[in-house]
């Protein structure tokens, strides 16, 4: 992209409540892909907070693309009553926190975490690697942030935001230091390379989120995770564009978004990413 394509969006306050995304891909911009078909599809627009129509070229693109308006709404919007703050002093847990742990049918035996509604705590379990349900977290911290109550009985979201008991407002807690880069791509791009269970030595690429580059690794031929691409180009296309450079908290964000400048605040963003 040329420098003219880059947009420097100033993040400023508006009347919009904080945006809560059910899936990280809902934040992706509409991507028509390189092909030339004319297919009516829908995407979630984080600026208008609505599902909107766009023309898809028929190949590639990204996950923010749905066959119908209903599917888009189901995946990316929440009922306003549940959106951010309950009238009580406690935010509502996502429904999937109340599902039982589910190992799925595969045989990967991966350590994951689930919220146990009996003990009200996040606990470890063995996940097979496929199917299962959304009460399935890669880290204990992620599980706690999304499903456990905070120390005062308040629901804490996965950006360390807690409902303030004094004025019912959302206040950022210092549980996470904002980093220079924030990732808004598929969650599997943040997982480590996983050789898998078999004995082959296939050349694959994985996205190294620490250095922000796609690197080769040897894949065993089965198992593993989705941070696994047959080419460097495919890896970059899937993962590289997920990064947004953050200059300062509430400051400048440099994006490569070809759209007119809009002033919007995406405050204390909650992204419930569950890639199964």
């Amino acid at each position: 992209d040329s420098e003219e394509d880059e947009e420097h969006t100033i993040i400023t306050d508006t009347e919009l409540p904080p945006l809560k995304l059910m899936h990280s891909f809902c934040a992706f911009k509409a991507d028509d892909g390189p092909c030339k078909a004319i297919m009516k599809r829908f995407f979630f627009n984080i600026f208008t907070r609505q599902c909107e129509e766009f023309i898809y070229g028929g190949c590639e693109g990204n996950q923010n693309r749905f066959e119908s308006l209903e599917e888009c709404k189901k995946m990316c919007t929440r009922d306003n009553a549940n959106r951010i703050i309950k009238t009580t002093l406690q935010q509502e847990k996502p429904d999937f926190c109340f599902l039982e742990e589910d190992p799925g049918i595969c045989r990967g035996y991966i350590t994951r975490y689930f919220y146990n509604n009996q003990t009200k705590q996040c606990e470890r379990f063995k996940y097979g690697g496929c199917l299962g349900n959304m009460n399935n977290f890669e880290t204990l911290e992620e599980c706690k942030n999304i499903c456990e109550d905070g120390p005062n009985g308040f629901q804490v979201d996965n950006y360390g935001t807690q409902l303030n008991a004094v004025n019912n407002s959302l206040t950022p807690q210092s549980t996470k230091v904002p980093s220079l880069f924030e990732f808004h791509g598929p969650s599997w791009c943040l997982t480590p390379a996983d050789r898998g269970l078999c004995r082959a030595n296939e050349n694959r690429f994985y996205y190294n989120s620490v250095i922000g580059k796609c690197r080769p690794f040897k894949y065993s031929g089965c198992g593993g995770n989705e941070n696994n691409f047959t080419s460097k180009q495919e890896c970059l296309r899937a993962c590289k564009k997920g990064f947004i450079q953050r200059i300062s908290k509430g400051g400048l964000i440099k994006t490569k978004r070809k759209r007119k400048k809009q002033r919007v605040k995406i405050a204390y963003e909650e992204i419930f990413v569950k890639n199964m």
Epitope: F25, P103, I105, C106, R107, C130, L131, N133, G224
Partner: antibody, heavy 124, light 108 residues
Framework: QVQLQQSGPGLVKPSQTLSLTCAIS??????????WGWIRQSPGRGLEWLGM?????????SYAVSVKSRITINPDTSKNQFSLQLNSVTPEDTAVYYC??????????????WGQGTLVTVSS | DIVLTQSPATLSLSPGERATLSCRAS???????LAWYQQKPGQAPRLLIY???TRATGVPARFNGSGSGTDFTLTISSLEPEDFAVYYC?????????FGQGTKVEIK
């Protein structure tokens, strides 16, 4: 050789319950490496996965959202079979119903054994 | 739900020709969780390929699966008379399990 034999009525009245059974031979419904499920096929809908059960030190089930409020899949370990119950049926539930085993092999999962299929018509 | 789109809807070929069937997923499903099935009229589907590229027991070597992420291909290197049927792809990555709408391979 694993085989699945389906049984159950081919005609169900609207608002009633569709009940089918799938008898397993050559494997166990309590197998630790398989899942047992139901799929239906109709001209309008194509192949539609309805749900499955599997045993991994305890029983688990997963159902399709489209039928979640109406469906029950149960194992019967004494007879080595599993059943499908679909409540409050309508003519839209008319389809060929298949039971199938999903095996998780080391290359990945797949439905490797299927029942013969039962055409269920919902009509008064 | 993960939507699987198969193309073309119909493929008209002669015995001995090569068939290339495509399956595109609406989300990344990795490389281990895609299966291909063959179905003939009046019969249940038959598993051909699992894990995107592994042939099921008894499936002839002319059937080959490839792909990962969102784009998958089933290739029949040289069509035999018994290969004319409908082919479905299926993802077993996440609930609900979903199928493509099918590609019919018919005799030209």
């Amino acid at each position: 050789q694993v085989q699945l034999q389906q049984s159950g009525p081919g005609l169900v009245k609207p608002s009633q319950t569709l009940s089918l059974t799938c008898a397993i031979s050559g494997d166990s419904v309590s197998s630790n490496s398989a899942a047992w499920g139901w799929i239906r096929q109709s001209p309008g809908r194509g192949l539609e996965w309805l749900g499955m059960i599997y045993y991994r030190s305890k029983w688990y089930n997963s159902y399709a959202v489209s039928v979640k409020s109406r469906i029950t899949i149960n194992p019967d370990t004494s007879k080595n079979q599993f059943s499908l119950q679909l409540n409050s049926v309508t003519p839209e539930d008319t389809a060929v119903y298949y039971c199938a085993r999903t095996m998780s092999k080391y290359g990945g999962p797949g439905m490797d054994v299927w029942g013969q299929g039962t055409l269920v018509t919902v009509s008064s | 739900d993960i939507v699987l789109t198969q193309s073309p809807a119909t493929l008209s070929l002669s015995p001995g020709e090569r068939a290339t069937l495509s399956c595109r997923a609406s989300q990344n499903i990795g490389s281990n969780y895609l299966a291909w099935y063959q179905q003939k009229p009046g019969q249940a589907p038959r598993l051909l390929i699992y894990g995107a590229s592994t042939r099921a027991t008894g499936v002839p070597a002319r059937f080959n699966g490839s792909g990962s992420g969102t784009d998958f291909t089933l290739t029949i290197s040289s069509l035999e008379p018994e290969d004319f049927a409908v082919y479905y792809c299926q993802q077993l990555n996440s609930i609900p399990v979903t199928f493509g709408q099918g590609t019919k391979v018919e005799i030209k």
